[in-house]
Interface confidence: low
C-alpha cells in the first residue's frame, strides 16, 4: 500500500481551522491479525529522507495523536489532551485520515507528516509517509481562507512506500 | 518516568485462580503493546502473555494457553492477567513489561518490579 | 518451540577485562519482515531485568557503549568491552521473533 497526499501546500490566515490530509492507496489487508497505526507529527526537509525526524505537533507526539483499527475502518482521537491542544485526528471508511488544527498561529508553520503502520502480531510490518507544508500567514497578504495546492502525481516525495 | 506497579499476587491453591494488574504511568499506555514475563523460582525468565496496542490481539506460550488472559483497560491505563487452574509450577514472580514503540518493535523495554504468585496446597 | 541457550553458565571475569557471552537459538530467529528480534537483558540481584541491546545490536537509551550486540541469524554474541563493578549481574538472552517468545537460560558474570 502506499500513502498519497491530495495537497502538498496549504497557505491558511491566521485564526482560521485546517485540515491536513492523508490517503491510504493500494490494497489493504484485512486480515484478522493486521491493524495499522496512523498518526501525524512535525518534521524538517532533511537532506536524506522528509518524514524522518519525528517531532511534536503543539506539543503532542506522534504517540498522542495515533489512530489504531483495522483497515478502511473510520476512526478519531477522543483524547482530551488532543483536543485541549486544538487538534483531532480522524479516519474515515475510504481510507482517508486526517488532522485538523483549530486556531493557527504562526508557530504553527511547517512540514508535516503523516504515518500509517501495517502492525502484524504486533510487529511494525510495512510503514508508509506522506508530507505536506503548512504556511500561515499574517497581515494584508495573508488570505482570507485557507488555500491548497494539490500534489503533481510526479512528486516522490508526497508519495512514499517503505 | 515510565512506572509499571504489579499487584494482585498471593498464596494460592492448585486450581485456584487469581487476577494480577498493572498500573501504567509516565505515558501514553495506549499507544504500547504489553507483556507479562515470570521469574521461577530458579530464576528463570518465562514470556507468558503479549497483547497488541488497542488489546484485539492476544499471544501466549502453550504452557498458559487456555488457562491465563491477558488483557489491557487503556481508558484505566491498567494490564491485567487473570490466572486460572493454577499449577505448582505457576509459581514465580510475574512481571509486567511495557513494549517500545511499534517503530522500533522490542519488547521489555520497561519493566515492574515484579508480583509474586506461589501456588501450594 | 525456539530454544535459546546461553554459554557459559557463569563467567568469571577480572574488572577492566573484556567479557563475551554467546546465544544460540535452535533455528533462525529472522522474523518475517525481515528484523530479528534478539535482545539482551541484565538482572541484578533484587532488581527486575533490563533492556541493554534490541535487534541484535542497537544499544537501548541509557546503556554505556561498553556494551555491544552482535549475530545474525542462529548466532548472538553480547560483548562487555570493559567490565565495571556494576556489571556484575545475570544476562539473558530473549527472542521475540517467533511465538512462543523465549529467553535463554542466563549467564551470570562474576569476579574471577
Known amino acids: 500500500f502506499k500513502v498519497a497526499t491530495p495537497y502538498s501546500l496549504y497557505v491558511c490566515p491566521e485564526g482560521q481551522n485546517v485540515t491536513l490530509t492523508c490517503r491510504l492507496l493500494g490494497p489493504v489487508d484485512k486480515g484478522h491479525d493486521v491493524t495499522f497505526y496512523k498518526t501525524w507529527y512535525r518534521s524538517s526537509r532533511g537532506e536524506v529522507q522528509t518524514c524522518s525526524e519525528r517531532r511534536p505537533i503543539r506539543n503532542l507526539t506522534f504517540q498522542d495523536l495515533h489512530l489504531h483499527h483495522g483497515g478502511h475502518q473510520a476512526a478519531n482521537t477522543s483524547h482530551d489532551l488532543a483536543q485541549r491542544h486544538g487538534l483531532e485526528s480522524a479516519s474515515d471508511h475510504h481510507g482517508n485520515f486526517s488532522i485538523t488544527m483549530r486556531n493557527l498561529t504562526l508557530l504553527d508553520s511547517g512540514l508535516y507528516c503523516c504515518l500509517v503502520v501495517e502492525i502484524r502480531h504486533h510487529h511494525s510490518e510495512h510503514r508508509v509517509h506522506g508530507a505536506m507544508e503548512l504556511q500561515v500567514q499574517t497581515g494584508k497578504d495573508a488570505p482570507s481562507n485557507c488555500v491548497v495546492y494539490p500534489s503533481s502525481s510526479q512528486d516522490s516525495e508526497n508519495i512514499t512506500a517503505a | 518516568e515510565v512506572q509499571l506497579v504489579e499487584s494482585g499476587g498471593d498464596l494460592v491453591k492448585p486450581g485456584g485462580s487469581l487476577k494480577l494488574s498493572c498500573a501504567a504511568s509516565g505515558f501514553t499506555f495506549s499507544s504500547y503493546g504489553m507483556s507479562w514475563v515470570r521469574q521461577t523460582p530458579d530464576k528463570r525468565l518465562e514470556w507468558v502473555a503479549t497483547i497488541s496496542i488497542g488489546g484485539s490481539y492476544t499471544y501466549y506460550p502453550d504452557s498458559v494457553k487456555g488457562r491465563f488472559t491477558i488483557s489491557r483497560d487503556n481508558a484505566k491505563n491498567t494490564l491485567y492477567l487473570q490466572l486460572s487452574s493454577l499449577k505448582s509450577e505457576d509459581t514465580a514472580l510475574y512481571y509486567c513489561?511495557?513494549?517500545?514503540?511499534?517503530?522500533?518493535?522490542?519488547?521489555?523495554?520497561?519493566w515492574g518490579q515484579g508480583t509474586l504468585v506461589t501456588v501450594s496446597a | 518451540d525456539v530454544l535459546m541457550t546461553q554459554t557459559p553458565l557463569s563467567l568469571p571475569v577480572s574488572l577492566g577485562d573484556q567479557a563475551s557471552i554467546s546465544c544460540r537459538s535452535s533455528q533462525s530467529i529472522v522474523h518475517s519482515n525481515g528484523n530479528t528480534y534478539l535482545e539482551w537483558y541484565l538482572q541484578k540481584p533484587g532488581q527486575s531485568p533490563k533492556l541493554l541491546i534490541y535487534k541484535v545490536s542497537n544499544r537501548f537509551s541509557g546503556v554505556p557503549d561498553r556494551f555491544s550486540g552482535s549475530g545474525s541469524g542462529t548466532d548472538f554474541t553480547l560483548k562487555i568491552s570493559r567490565v565495571a563493578a556494576e556489571d556484575l549481574a545475570v544476562y539473558y538472552c530473549?527472542?521475540?521473533?517467533?511465538?512462543?517468545?523465549?529467553f535463554g537460560g542466563g549467564t551470570k558474570l562474576e569476579i574471577k
Open positions: 530473549f527472542q521475540g521473533s517467533h511465538v512462543p517468545y523465549t
Open positions: 513489561a511495557r513494549h517500545s514503540s511499534i517503530y522500533d518493535g522490542y519488547y521489555g523495554a520497561y
